[in-house]
Amino acid sequence: GITNINCSGHIWVEPATIFKMGMNISIYCQAAIKNCQPRKLHFYKNGIKERFQITRINKTTARLWYKNFLEPHASMYCTAECPKHFQETLICGKDISSGYPPDIPDEVTCVIYEYSGNMTCTWNAGKLTYIDTKYVVHVKSLETEEEQQYLTSSYINISTDSLQGGKKYLVWVQAANALGMEESKQLQIHLDDIVIPSAAVISRAETINATVPKTIIYWDSQTTIEKVSCEMRYKATTNQTWNVKEFDTNFTYVQQSEFYLEPNIKYVFQVRCQETGKRYWQPWSSLFFHKTPETVPQVTSKAFQHDTWNSGLTVASISTGHLTSDNRGDIG
């Protein structure tokens, strides 16, 4: 960057090189060039010469003043016009940054996705700071008082093998940058209470011809957790409002859930689960589409993006890919 150049003088910023966005700042340039009494001192921001708010302080020093500086980053350098020199002589340069102190981190959440071997902690960092902001995640055992700290720029994955102070912990997040430091409230966790079961996946759907046609959704999870509660939500793709069905589930076999749906309508389904009585849910599964047949039943080979119709007794939809859910991060 600009800071690596060889200087023939000195450039500095008041109040500091990193300052709060919107502040008034002064940039000072002091020449120390052999055999040169500068006729004029020039300031450049991002390579463009500044024309206004420059004050000559003495023979070797000038000041550039900015009101309400709002740029997150700028490269400043200054030059001197020396007698008998055809070109301007470079004095020095500096990268400057403006931004905000961190907000208090809130909504600290820690979960263990089954089989991951990690505890994943996330938080709401608040408003954008524009400057380098680091987060320290503190994990303190309520049983041994031992504390581990993890330095990160965003979320953190902590190996569950490193959590050797029992099952109960306090977790909190400290945010710090050049403009300030803030700290979250402490979150109390029990490792057994924050496990999110292995993802539930809808594998296929079929509509069976009966007096009243019914649609069966087949879904499963690789979880080893015994007591699991799940929700399946579904709606016609033209609707805004979801219908929700609740299940107490035992995943020793593939689940079959029955729905009585309107004919000849494209529906979308999603499922999510949690360990019964615990706090955190899985994110909703990928969107699964199924179109119900007209009153005369028909068959589809897949109804994910493309609907291919054949005559027959059932309509089946098979999950062949993944579409991103509309709110995958919904774990609370």
Partner: antibody, heavy 121, light 112 residues
Framework: QVQLVQSGAEVKKPGSSVKVSCKAS?????????MCWVRQAPGQGLEWMGC?????????YYANWAKGRVTITADESTSTAYMELSSLRSEDTAVYYC????????????WGQGTLVTVSS | DIQMTQSPSSLSASVGDRVTITCQAS??????LAWYQQKPGKAPKLLIY???KLAAGVPSRFSGSGSGTDFTLTISSLQPEDFATYYC??????????????FGQGTKVEIK
Amino acid sequence: QVQLVQSGAEVKKPGSSVKVSCKASGIDFNSNYYMCWVRQAPGQGLEWMGCIYVGSHVNTYYANWAKGRVTITADESTSTAYMELSSLRSEDTAVYYCATSGSSVLYFKFWGQGTLVTVSS
Amino acid sequence: DIQMTQSPSSLSASVGDRVTITCQASENIYSFLAWYQQKPGKAPKLLIYSASKLAAGVPSRFSGSGSGTDFTLTISSLQPEDFATYYCQQTNRYSNPDIYNVFGQGTKVEIK
């Protein structure tokens, strides 16, 4: 068994700085640990100054009153912690202790012998 | 800012007496509290940590209790060597930017 050996007594002028060292033996420097500093003015109670956390990264924490005046550092190569106090005033006359449990807990099983710092013109 | 308030500031007692010192935190510190004994000219000595756990080598007449905000140090039968000053200390977290002191003001136990 952790042992903490502090530098000797100091007499300082107001406005100057003092740097007290604390050499630790018996700490596993591959593990996480806190090293903290506590002072005690004559006839007064214990006053926490700050701590340094040494682990996968280094973090320092200071009492509100000590911010900007106290700097705590650690040199892992010599197993030594330092506490520097600047802009000394007469009310900084106290015995300064380093303290740790040799791990990442904040209670102190082990204390240095104390360093008397006298601030006088 | 967690503040630690210790009471009483001093007390007079006789050998064999049961002595109780209390410490109150201005916010929940769970069981993260330690008690120290200090004699004149000496460094403090850890007695109790995690509110109720006895440090190595500390006689069983010392005990600690409490959690959250209210804590107690009890000496069941005061011995001559127990006349000293006692301090509580919160050991929850020091990373909070606003901490002033983590110790209580101290309780001096004197001979009646």
